[in-house]
């Protein structure tokens, strides 16, 4: 806290310049008035000031605006947003996706600070829903933020937004994220064609449901081995070795690598051996001939 | 980004001389001021030096003018400051700064 002390004579700033960066923090607290700081806040990211000195501004600031900074002055607060604590953020109403640009921009080639995580959390809560520009943006600086999202929260996005998300936005997605994600891409794509529509699907595979395999086994899609990895494991399983076949295409081969990890080893498990041989792929650990399967969950759900 | 690297400093008598160098990278500079800044043991960061690149525009610390002179070569991107007449009180990490951006900082130290 900067205690109160008269501005010397001749030092009482006119604007926000350079000159500012040689006053003493008491000198800043005493000869800076708030409101010219925050009418000239665009002008503060070209000039030095150390963290002392910011620590100051955002003080002078927070006198002014005990409730919240308005969103004129959060558009051009540039590196002073650095400052913020999240506790600050809480209070703005950002509603324009300038002032998020603005300030993610500051943040950039960062990883997502708390401060950004709760200006995002308003700014999504300003709007009602994650908007495609808005997904557009967010990605555009944090290519994880989709994935960073809890199922609840990703099924405000609505499919429309879902054209803006790029196969790399997908990568950290757990399976429960993409179990939300992909009935709404699904939706979103679904007047496409089917090689189209496979490109696009690809990256949201990891949330759909056997049918959906079984149907896309039907296209000719060659479906590549780190797609398939990514199944959900229940997904897979019911799937029969044709079936498999005709979704990875000449990409079956690969399965032979894959043997020891799901969903590839349980998948195998499931499987006559006759069938898996029919692949000439020497998979092991089928079923042997002459064995019966028993479906043991289907049989507790008739019991 | 902008990424800002100093050099030039060490050790000199008092009353000696000594150019400080900064090389600019990264983003055009034209939009920033830049400064020269200095910070001795146990005490703040200060200003010693700033030059508005668009402006050209130049201020000095009271505790350095006449003594040092800021300047600037565009086509190479550095910031540079000469420093005469040098004191023991001058002795500190000095550093390089464009706006939000800050070198890592190089050491002058005047002693006999």
């Known amino acids: 806290e900067v205690e109160k002390t008269a501005c010397p004579s001749g030092k009482k700033a006119r604007e926000i310049d350079e000159s500012l960066i040689f006053y003493k923090k008491w000198e800043l607290e005493a000869c800076v008035d708030a409101a010219l700081l925050a009418t000239q806040m665009d002008r503060v990211n070209a000039i030095p000031f150390t963290y002392e000195q910011l620590d100051v501004l955002k003080h002078k600031l927070d006198e002014l605006y005990p409730q919240g900074y308005p969103e004129s002055v959060i558009q051009h607060l540039g590196y002073l947003f650095l400052k913020m604590s999240p506790e600050d953020i809480r209070k703005w109403n950002v509603t324009s996706l300038e002032t998020l640009k603005a300030l993610l921009e500051v943040n950039k080639g960062h990883e997502m600070s708390p401060q950004v995580a709760t200006l995002i959390d308003r700014f999504v809560k300003g709007r009602g829903q994650l908007d495609k520009d808005t997904l557009d943006t967010l990605t555009a600086f944090y290519p994880g933020y989709l994935c960073s999202l809890s199922p609840e929260e990703l099924s405000s996005v609505p499919p429309s937004s879902i054209w803006a998300v790029r196969p790399q936005d997908l990568d950290t997605c757990d399976p429960r994220q993409l179990d939300v994600l992909y009935p709404k891409a699904r939706l979103a794509f679904q007047n496409m064609n089917g090689s189209e529509y496979f490109v696009k699907i690809q990256s949201f595979l990891g949330g759909a449901p056997t049918e959906d395999l079984k149907a896309l086994s039907q296209q000719n899609v060659s479906m590549d081995l780190a797609t398939f990895m990514k199944l959900r494991t229940d997904a897979v399983l019911p799937l029969t070795v044709a079936e498999v076949q005709k979704l990875l295409g000449p990409h079956v081969e690969g399965l032979k690598a894959e043997e020891r990890h799901r969903p590839v080893r349980d998948w195998i498990l499931r499987q006559r051996q006759d069938d898996l041989d029919t692949l000439g792929l020497g998979l092991q650990g089928g079923i042997p001939n002459g064995y019966l399967v028993l479906d043991l969950s289907m049989q507790e759900a008739l019991s | 980004q902008v990424q800002l690297v100093e050099s030039g400093g060490g050790l000199v008598q008092p009353g000696g001389s000594l150019r400080l160098s900064c090389a600019a990278s990264g983003r055009t500079l034209e939009s920033y001021v830049m400064a020269w800044f200095r910070q001795a043991p146990g005490k703040e960061r200060e200003a010693v030096a700033s030059?508005?690149?668009?402006?050209?525009?130049?201020i000095y610390a009271d505790s350095v003018k006449g003594r040092f002179t800021i300047s600037r070569d565009n086509s190479k991107n550095t910031l540079y400051l000469q420093m005469n007449s040098l004191r023991a009180e001058d002795t500190a990490v000095y550093y390089c700064a464009a706006g939000r951006y800050w070198g890592q900082g190089t050491q002058v130290t005047v002693s006999s």
């Open positions: 030059i508005n690149w668009s402006s050209g525009r130049l």
